[in-house]
């Protein structure tokens, strides 16, 4: 028994005075606790505890289940213990077959012995199967067998505690080890859609998928910059061992504009945390915003092609699209398609393909689009650049030579005089009158210019050239005339195309 110096409280003394006691099944257990301040006896085995306020603990007919630790405690809280084995050849093990272990931790197979003198106390696999090679264990007859550093691979391992008794192997009832995995990575989180656009009153529902090795992963939906608890529903599945999936669905049955914002799905485990966000935008009504991809004023050369391209945002989805010119709707030559195949796409593209445009095809081309809430339109002003065309070239009764040319941009008319038989007209002649005339065609058609010179200024035979030109090209007309005496005769106008 322990000894202490006088004056200090001492632990109780127990008779018999040994740490371990072996009795046979059916025999009496008699334990005496001697202490002036005796309080109680406590019995413990597995998770069982019993108390006795008598200083003598007597069990008349011992059973295997009386195997365990008997502790006497005094009023100072000091104690002394004795471990009693009740040897029962028919019941070598006391068991609690609950067996859960955490990965990388030790776990106890609870099969304490009723007889410490049996040999080869160890673990064995069920049905003669060998234990995993790396499984290490430490037997303790009073507690059971400690499996060291549980591995994930031991999950659902079936085993027995085993002893040799009189040369024969005796097995306990079977134990099945359930291994709780350690978190060795953060949870994997994903969201059904990264952004949502809704009209007021529509239902907002978003699902977060959380994947981890076990169901003890924590997850929640949070509104950024808000502490409000959100209503969410869960579904979960175990896809085999160590592959757990949870779906957390957040729903707002009737979304309002002020519900707009960023929602975060947050998950954490003992290793760390992960999150993913989704953005909700709630609008009071739908919208359409059109963005021209080219300038809305377009200049194109005669005979060339041009594509009128718009991008537009439409929510809800566009229902009607059309391209119009001169109050006529195009039935072909255009295409309309979503900018992306993404489910949440609200951006679209419309293209009108104008081919081999003629000078008469300038004008306003309008794209119209509508959805269930709004209409929108955008206009392109198309100008067709045409080289000048000389419409008339005449000698008027008043002696004027007049040249009228049409084209776009507005042509410039220059006059030249070529004396005699020279081929090149270089001497320029100033016009008497220049006017831009109103065209009778559409407002985006060719511009008509009229220019006149006084033929009386010419005193010699020769040729007068009227040259009309713009950025696209040039065209000339010629007046040939000769003098007969004092009179100009034989004026023969003719044109010469100059590219």
């Amino acid at each position: 028994q322990p000894s202490v110096s006088p004056g200090e409280p001492s632990p109780p003394s127990i008779h018999p005075g040994k740490s371990d006691l072996i009795v046979r099944v059916g025999d009496e257990i008699r334990l005496l606790c001697t202490d002036p301040g005796f309080v109680k006896w406590t019995f413990e085995i597995l998770d069982e505890t019993n108390e006795n306020k008598q200083n003598e603990w007597i069990t008349e007919k011992a059973e295997a289940t009386n195997t365990g630790k008997y502790t006497c405690t005094n009023k100072h809280g000091l104690s002394n213990s004795i471990y009693v084995f009740v040897r029962d050849p028919a019941k070598l093990f006391l068991v609690d077959r609950s067996l859960y272990g955490k990965e990388d931790n030790d776990t106890l197979v609870r099969c304490p012995l009723t007889d410490p003198e049996v040999t080869n106390y160890s673990l064995k696999g069920c049905q003669g199967k060998p234990l995993p090679k790396d499984l290490r264990f430490i037997p303790d007859p009073k507690a059971g067998i400690m499996i060291k550093s549980v591995k994930r691979a031991y999950h659902r391992l079936c085993l027995h505690c085993s002893v040799d008794q009189e040369g024969k192997s005796v097995l306990s009832e079977k134990f099945i080890l359930k291994v709780r995995p350690a978190f060795k990575a953060v949870p994997v989180v994903s969201v059904s859609k990264a952004s949502y656009l809704l009209r007021e009153g529509e239902e907002f529902t978003v699902t977060c998928t959380i994947k981890d090795v076990s169901s003890s992963v924590y997850s929640t939906w949070k509104r950024e910059n808000s502490q409000t608890k959100l209503q969410e529903k869960y579904n979960s599945w175990h896809h085999g061992d160590f592959n757990y999936e949870r779906q957390a669905t957040l729903t707002i049955s009737s979304a309002r504009v002020n519900d707009s914002g960023v929602f975060m799905c947050y998950a954490n485990n003992t290793f760390g945390s992960a999150n993913v966000t989704t953005t909700l935008e709630v609008v009071d009504k739908g919208f359409i915003n059109i963005f021209p991809m080219i300038n809305t004023t377009v200049f194109v050369n005669d005979g060339e092609n041009v594509d009128l391209i718009v991008e537009y945002e439409a929510f809800p989805k566009p229902e009607h699209q059309q391209w119009i010119y001169m109050n006529r709707t195009f039935t072909d030559k255009w295409e309309d398609y979503p900018k992306s195949e993404n489910e949440s796409n609200i951006r679209y593209v419309s293209e009108l393909h104008l081919t081999r445009l003629k000078g008469t095809e300038g004008g306003t081309y309008t794209f119209l689009v509508s959805n269930s809430d709004v209409n929108a339109a955008i206009a392109f002003n198309v100008y067709v650049n045409t080289k000048p065309e000389i419409l008339t070239y005449d000698r008027l009764v008043n002696g004027m030579l007049q040249c009228v040319a049409a084209g776009f941009p507005e042509p410039t008319i220059d006059w030249y005089f070529c004396p005699g038989t020279e081929q090149r007209c270089s001497a320029s002649v100033l016009p008497v009158d220049v006017q831009t005339l109103n065209s009778s065609g559409p407002p985006f058609g060719k511009l008509v210019v009229q220019s006149s010179i006084d033929s009386s200024a010419f005193k010699h035979n020769g040729t007068v050239e009227c040259k009309a030109y713009n950025d696209v090209g040039k065209t000339s007309a010629y007046f040939n005339f000769a003098f007969k005496g004092n009179n100009k005769e034989q004026i023969h106008p003719h044109t010469l195309f100059t590219p």
């Epitope: 597995l46 998770d47 069982e48 505890t49 019993n50 289940t65 068991v95 609690d96 077959r97 609950s98 067996l99 859960y100 955490k102 999950h155 659902r156 009832e173 099945i176 359930k178 291994v179 709780r180 995995p181 076990s214 169901s215 003890s216 061992d241």
Partner: nanobody
Framework: EVQLLESGGGLVQPGGSLRLSCAAS????????MSWVRQAPGKGLEWVSA????????YYADSVKGRFTISRDNSKNTLYLQMNSLRAEDTAVYYC????????????????RGQGTLVTVSS
């Protein structure tokens, strides 16, 4: 064949009481610490209470402490759960199961679990 058969569930008003029983066959329950677990509609499995092999040690979830009492009769191979002061949030299917994991996680489940008995607490 091992069977755990729960009984005693039913409809009860808030504040009322029920006693659940779990009778085992094909299995000696004295070799297991035993647990009661429950599953509320749309929720995961939640541990409620556990009892040691001989019945002297009992364990409870915070949500039921002071209201529920677990007990066992190894001679009858039966586990019990006395439920008092019942609340709407106690509505669930209650299962008895073999084993007790002090972490409360029960990863990998139980060696054996019953089919459950429905407890509905409603006025």
């Amino acid at each position: 064949e091992v069977q755990l058969l729960e009984s005693g569930g039913g409809l009860v008003q808030p504040g009322g009481s029920l006693r659940l029983s779990c009778a085992a066959s094909g299995l000696t329950i004295s070799t297991y610490a035993m647990s009661w677990v429950r599953q509320a509609p749309g929720k995961g499995l939640e541990w409620v209470s556990a009892i040691s092999t001989g019945g002297s040690s009992t364990y409870y979830a915070d949500s039921v402490k002071g209201r529920f009492t677990i007990s066992r009769d190894n001679s009858k191979n039966t586990l019990y759960l006395q439920m008092n002061s019942l609340r709407a949030e106690d509505t669930a299917v209650y299962y008895c199961a073999t084993g007790y994991d002090s972490s409360g996680h029960y990863y990998g489940g139980f060696d054996y679990r019953g089919q459950g008995t429905l407890v509905t607490v409603s006025s």
